[in-house]
Interface confidence: medium
């Protein structure tokens, strides 16, 4: 009897949908795996007789529930199927947006770039999929614990009247208000303000 794959899960970030599993202990030799998806009531092969422990399902429709399954195989034997259900639009993790930060005197000018979606048009981003897409921005004075959160209305924001010659850190994440779903924070970007332009030099 061939044991089934273990720890079967979907690792999905920005609709890059990778079905992952672990190979069970099997004394007779190396196992191969076949992964399938349900399409119009028929299971279709996606990865056949692979020695890998993952299979890319990024081409699935983003909407609706998908049934995926994987089994282990050895020679003419095979394990039972292990099934999981996956809804990309609900289950994918929203990766961190990009952010460009520019210092102008005592202001930080920020531009946000929604995460790109692989296997789509070059310009296709998470914003194209989620109508309610918005950004959460948080910023703080470097070295302090107090954080300030804002929700920009657009793909850019300006933090004005900051303390001069002070380093501020900023990070951004995607947020879907209608789903109350937040994405991953970007890495903090820290920049030092310069002089206050209203002060004569």
């Amino acid at each position: 009897m061939v044991p089934p794959p273990e720890n079967v899960r979907m690792n999905s970030v920005n609709f890059k949908n990778i079905l992952q599993w672990e190979s069970p202990a099997f004394a007779k030799g190396n196992l191969t795996f076949t992964a399938q998806y349900l399409s119009y009531r028929i299971f279709q092969d996606k990865c056949m007789n692979t020695t890998l422990t993952e299979c890319d399902f990024s081409s699935l429709s983003k909407y609706g529930d998908h049934t995926l399954r994987v089994r282990a195989e050895f020679a003419d034997e095979h394990s039972d199927w292990v099934n999981i259900t996956f809804c990309p639009v609900d289950d994918t993790i929203i990766g961190p947006p990009g952010m460009q930060v520019e210092v102008l005197a005592d202001s930080l000018h920020m531009r946000f770039l929604a995460p790109k979606i692989e296997n789509e048009y070059e310009t296709w981003t998470m914003k194209n999929v989620y109508n309610s897409w918005t950004y959460n921005v948080q910023y703080w004075k470097n070295g302090t614990d107090e954080k300030f959160q804002i929700t920009p209305q657009y793909d850019f924001e300006v933090l004005r009247n900051l303390e001069p010659w002070t380093t501020y850190c900023v990070q951004v994440r995607g947020f879907l208000p209608d789903r109350n779903k937040a994405g991953e924070w970007s890495e903090p970007v820290c920049e030092q303000t310069t002089h206050d332009e209203t002060v004569p030099s």
Partner: nanobody
Framework: QVQLQESGGGSVQAGGSLRLSCTVS????????MGWFRQAPGKEREGVAT????????YYANSVKGRFTISRDNAKNTAYLQMNSLKPEDTAIYYC??????????????????RGQGTQVTVSS
């Protein structure tokens, strides 16, 4: 420098429950992932559970699925591990770990960048 403070370990009879807490301090950026791993004497480290703080998505090792629950309080930068129906084989030092990088939900927590000092959990039969 990130500091992690674990608490809630102790000794319990088989079938009992414990709740571990892990608080992140001394870091100004928000945590993306928090998790727990454990190490028993003479055994390899084992990832136990992880949580993505954004959506609250969770992932568990097969050995604890259905018995352990990971949760988080983002406002307090704290993660919790509720451990029910404990077994003697759950005896180990439990470590909290956090990371600020992306795409780590299915990685064992011992691969995370920052780890705590650990708290002992002992389950007797």
């Amino acid at each position: 420098q990130v500091q992690l403070q674990e608490s809630g370990g102790g000794s319990v009879q088989a079938g009992g429950s414990l709740r571990l807490s892990c608080t992140v301090s001394r870091y100004t950026a928000s945590v993306n992932y928090m998790g727990w791993f454990r190490q028993a004497p003479g055994k390899e480290r084992e990832g136990v559970a992880t949580i993505f703080t954004g959506a609250g998505t969770t992932y568990y090792a097969n050995s604890v699925k259905g018995r352990f629950t990971i949760s988080r309080d983002n406002a307090k930068n704290t993660a919790y591990l509720q451990m029910n129906s404990l077994k003697p084989e759950d005896t180990a030092i439990y470590y909290c770990a956090v990371d600020f990088r992306g795409g780590l939900l299915y990685r064992p927590a011992y691969e995370y960048t920052y780890r705590g000092q650990g708290t002992q959990v002992t389950v007797s039969s």
